[in-house]
């Protein structure tokens, strides 16, 4: 006889609440002559053999319940034209049962811990009753072909919920299950799948870029947020409000939205779903300057590509601090930011900061009632030599006959550091060049005592890394001054 449970040409197991016995086999070569099945009790009626006729061309048969006793062990074999067809099989009616499908309840609990997770409650099959079953569950995205099996298998004496982890937001999933008698055979059929939809995730981090607290009228602010799942295309709904007024922007692509003037709060939520977490309400109210952090300092961090930022608390403790930074010339949506608890008064900004590139760094204290930002600080990872010199132009003589010149600032991205000083140079035709350093706070020079003739003037600017190239020349023609300038 074949060991119980191993697959073979003849397989038998009991099915369903009536307890009928199903036997099936691989199709026979001779389809015209129907086989005959025999079964014999090995436990209760060892002398009785039952014969079961099989309809022609059929490779299965049902043995009626009245032919055997429920907890019996049966020996089953088959013949065709009086010749044995297979080795006889022993069937333990206590364990060789094919259970019904488990019931999966439609209430799906979804939580967002480290990942998006779904929990489903289930009930064991109605049949077989009072048996401990092992049940296996699987899930897949609705459009997918292949299923993912869930581990571990669950027992019906515990009814642990089914848990699915690492799900994608805004995605349709299906889950189904099947059961097997513990230490038995075979598996039941897979249940019809339960479908459920995961919600879209709220943006993880909402902030405001630009001059939300600008009082000079140049208020240009952008609400920005971090995409919780960059691979999933989601649109958002953004609400802004002030007093009784609320404005809504729908179908906003990730991850920015202009802030209308005078708005006091903003909320961002996934466009087409109700979130299970209340969305974050960012207050846009500008608080008094004394609530802002003070003494913000920025420096290059030793032995690391980051930038160190420190500050002191304002007059009261905030809920948190936000430090944001952007490269000079970047658009408002290119902002980076990090949140820090109120006890932190320093941070090392992460990322690769390029030498010679100015970064605008702002520390903001966040309160339940609004925001208070310290003045922004321009900082550098490393200063480089300037790429250009300032343009020079002539101002009205003061007094008449004494030339006055002025020069402009070199654009920040060409300056590549902080100006330590300017160098002002003048060259007369046929004579050597004379240069003079002046403070970085000075952008004009009076030229008394110049002798008659033509002159060329230019200015360079220096950072701590060194002196930059000369700016464009200015030509001067002096008909009347007699005393030479040194």
């Amino acid at each position: 006889t074949r060991p119980h449970g191993s697959p073979g040409p003849l397989q038998c197991y009991s099915v369903g609440p009536l307890g009928i016995l199903n036997c099936s086999w691989e199709p026979l070569g001779d389809l015209e002559t129907p086989p005959v099945l025999y079964h014999q009790s090995q436990k209760y009626h060892p002398n009785r053999v039952w014969e079961v006729k099989v309809p022609s061309k059929q490779s299965w048969v049902t043995i009626p319940r009245e032919q055997f006793t429920m907890a019996d062990k049966l020996l089953i074999w088959g013949t065709q034209k009086g010749r044995p067809l297979w080795s006889s099989v022993s069937v333990n009616l206590e364990t060789q049962m094919k259970p019904d499908t488990p019931q999966i309840f439609s209430q799906v609990d979804i939580s967002e811990e480290a990942t998006l997770e779904a929990t489903v409650q289930w009930a064991p099959p109605v049949w077989p009753p009072q048996k401990v079953l092992i049940c296996q569950f699987r899930y897949k995205e609705c459009q997918a072909e292949t299923w993912t099996r869930l581990e571990p298998q669950l027992k019906t004496d515990g009814l642990t919920p089914v848990e699915m982890q690492n799900l994608e937001p805004g995605t349709c999933y299906q889950v189904s299950g099947r059961c097997q008698v513990e230490n038995g055979y075979p598996w039941g059929e897979w249940s019809s799948p339960l479908s459920f939809q995961t919600p879209f995730l709220d943006p993880e981090d909402v902030w405001v870029s630009g001059t939300v607290c600008e009082t000079s009228g140049k208020r240009a602010a952008l609400l920005v947020w971090k995409d919780p799942r960059p691979c999933v295309q989601v649109t958002y709904t953004v609400w802004f409000g002030a007093g009784d007024i609320t404005t809504t922007q729908e179908e906003v692509p990730c991850c920015k939205s202009p802030v209308p003037a005078w708005m006091e709060w903003a909320v961002v939520s996934p466009g087409n779903s109700t979130s299970w977490v209340p969305p974050t309400n960012l207050s846009l109210v500008c608080l008094a300057p004394e609530s802002a952090p003070c003494d913000v300092g920025v420096s290059s961090a030793d032995g690391s590509p980051g930038i160190k930022v420190t500050w002191k608390q304002g007059t009261r403790k905030p809920l948190e601090y936000v430090v944001d930074w952007a490269q000079d010339g970047d658009s408002l949506d290119k902002l980076n930011w990090t949140r820090l608890p109120p006890g932190n008064l320093s941070t090392l900004l992460p990322g690769e900061f390029k030498g010679g590139v100015p970064y605008r760094i702002t520390v903001t204290a966040v309160y339940s009632g609004g925001l208070a930002a310290a003045p922004s600080v321009w900082g550098f990872r490393e200063e480089l030599v300037p790429l250009a010199g300032p343009a020079v132009w002539r101002l009205p003589d003061d007094p008449p006959g004494t030339p006055v010149v002025a020069w402009g600032e070199v654009p920040r991205h060409q300056l590549r550091g902080q100006a330590t000083h300017y160098t002002f140079c003048i060259q007369s035709r046929g004579l050597s060049t004379v240069c003079r350093n002046v403070s970085s706070q000075t952008q004009t020079a009076t030229l008394p005592n110049l002798h008659l003739g033509s002159f060329k003037l230019w200015v360079t600017v220096s950072t701590v890394a060194g002196q930059g190239p000369p700016g464009p020349n200015l030509s001067l023609h002096l008909p009347d001054n007699r005393i030479r300038w040194k």
Epitope: V296, G297, V298, S299, G417, S439, V464
Partner: nanobody, 123 residues
């Protein structure tokens, strides 16, 4: 690489004066400062100056008595200390860094340090 060397420390009676000097060699610093540390106390900022720009900043405890200045010809930053008090007794350190914003006397931003020079003021 920036190298810093202090000089000018010593002993003086209360009410007297001393001039500390810090010689700097190397590039890429825009701010220099003087810090001090008395035995059993935390290091504290005394005065700082922006190189080239000439802006200065003083701790409240030394305002009106100490003056920080830059001598471009000698490439030094000096600290003139007048009306010295016994509580000014400490080891004085010169520090330098590439620092921006208003954290003038925050030692975390200064990444180059001298060995220190001792100042002792007796009553």
């Amino acid at each position: 690489q920036v190298q810093l060397q202090e000089s000018g420390g010593g002993s003086v009676q209360a009410g007297g004066s001393l001039r500390l000097s810090c010689a700097a060699s190397g590039y890429s610093i825009n701010r220099m400062g003087w810090f001090r540390q008395a035995p059993g106390k935390e290091r504290e900022g005394v005065a700082a100056i922006s190189i080239g720009g000439g802006r200065t900043y003083y701790a409240d405890s030394v305002k009106g008595r100490f003056t920080i200045s830059q001598d471009n010809a000698k490439n030094t930053v000096d600290l003139q200390m007048n009306s010295l008090k016994p509580e000014d007794t400490a080891m004085y350190y010169c520090a330098a860094g590439l620092v921006y914003g208003e954290a003038w006397l925050d030692s975390r931003h200064y990444n180059k340090w001298g060995q220190g020079t001792q100042v002792t003021v007796s009553s």
